[in-house]
Interface confidence: medium
């Protein structure tokens, strides 16, 4: 029987290379059974994770999983860093692994990723 605990499916050491100035959506895959949990995003600052209170977020519901999305409109250079989503469920706090955004300045961005780069770093597809 499938567990009815809330699960957050951010892979350990996941990362995204993104371009300053572009919009970007950071997804937190959330699995739950009946009631959708309250999910928040925070940004790591040393050992503490600072809650992102004033940022635009949304839910995307799919058949077997939901996504809690943090919107960057647009990405700014200081968005560089590690993020974590967490869910409050039945008085429990469930935290995801952190995911890291590597923000590239437009000035130094190469014209486009090479095929080798795309093969070895598939997250570049989300630029």
């Amino acid at each position: 029987k499938e567990s009815c605990d809330v699960q957050l499916y951010i892979k350990r050491q996941s990362e995204h290379s993104i371009l300053a100035g572009d919009p970007f959506e950071l997804e937190c895959p959330v699995k739950y059974c009946a009631n959708r949990p309250h999910v928040t995003w925070c940004k790591l600052n040393g050992t503490t994770c600072v809650k992102l209170e004033d940022r635009q977020t949304s839910w995307k519901e799919e058949k077997n999983i939901s996504f809690f999305i943090l919107h960057f409109e647009p990405v700014l250079p200081n968005d560089n860093g590690s993020y974590r989503c967490s869910a409050n469920f039945q008085s429990n706090l469930i935290e995801s692994h952190s995911t890291t955004l590597y923000v590239t300045d437009v000035k130094s961005a190469s014209e486009r990723p090479s095929k080798d780069e795309m093969a070895s770093r598939p997250w570049l597809l989300y630029r």
């Epitope: 371009l19 300053a20 100035g21 572009d22 919009p23 959506e25 409109e73 647009p74 700014l76 250079p77 200081n78 300045d105 437009v106 000035k107 961005a109 486009r112 990723p113 795309m118 570049l124 597809l125 989300y126 630029r127």
Partner: antibody, heavy 117, light 111 residues
Amino acid sequence: QVQLQQPGAELVKPGASVKLSCKASGYTFTSYWMHWVKQRPGQGLEWIGMIHPNSGSTNYNEKFKSKATLTVDKSSSTAYMQLSSLTSEDSAVYYCARKRGGLGDYWGQGTSVTVSS
Amino acid sequence: DIVLTQSPASLAVSLGQRATISCRASKSVSTSGYSYMHWYQQKPGQPPKLLIYLASNLESGVPARFSGSGSGTDFTLNIHPVEEEDAATYYCQHSRELPYTFGGGTKLEIK
């Protein structure tokens, strides 16, 4: 080299819809946002919205939300913009542009849409 | 939405002289040391062409007679010395937030 091919012109009747195409080549279509810009004859440029071909994620200018619908066909590396309930105000040149960091760094030649009965 | 006001709406400059075009934003388009303002050139029957990005960076292949400056809400495009092929309409555009907006354009005529 990067190319964005758009049909030269479309003539449509008031109240009808039109689907404009933008065929991309010379780069990885799914890696870059595509945006669309409107230019009325003798007027300035208006940003309509954009779509990410990989995810289908879209962002619209509120002004065009009920007018334009952006889609893509990854298999043919083509972006589309459907314009509905056309009026004379929609007569314009519509450009697609490959997006890089908030800039349109490659542009199609534009499709001229004329709304006339 | 951020409103971009360009001035003048048109100007005529003698060959070899300096053309200066201004763009004022209704709120700051600068943050974290970056100014999200860009300049385009458009000639009749052609799509816009990117000249300057992030306020002051020359796009690859654009002649060095084009330069951009400014931060916050006030930006300037300079062309010096002006050449005949520079006759065109110039637009500023910001990408600080959605929706992106363009200035109303400045038409440059060469005397």
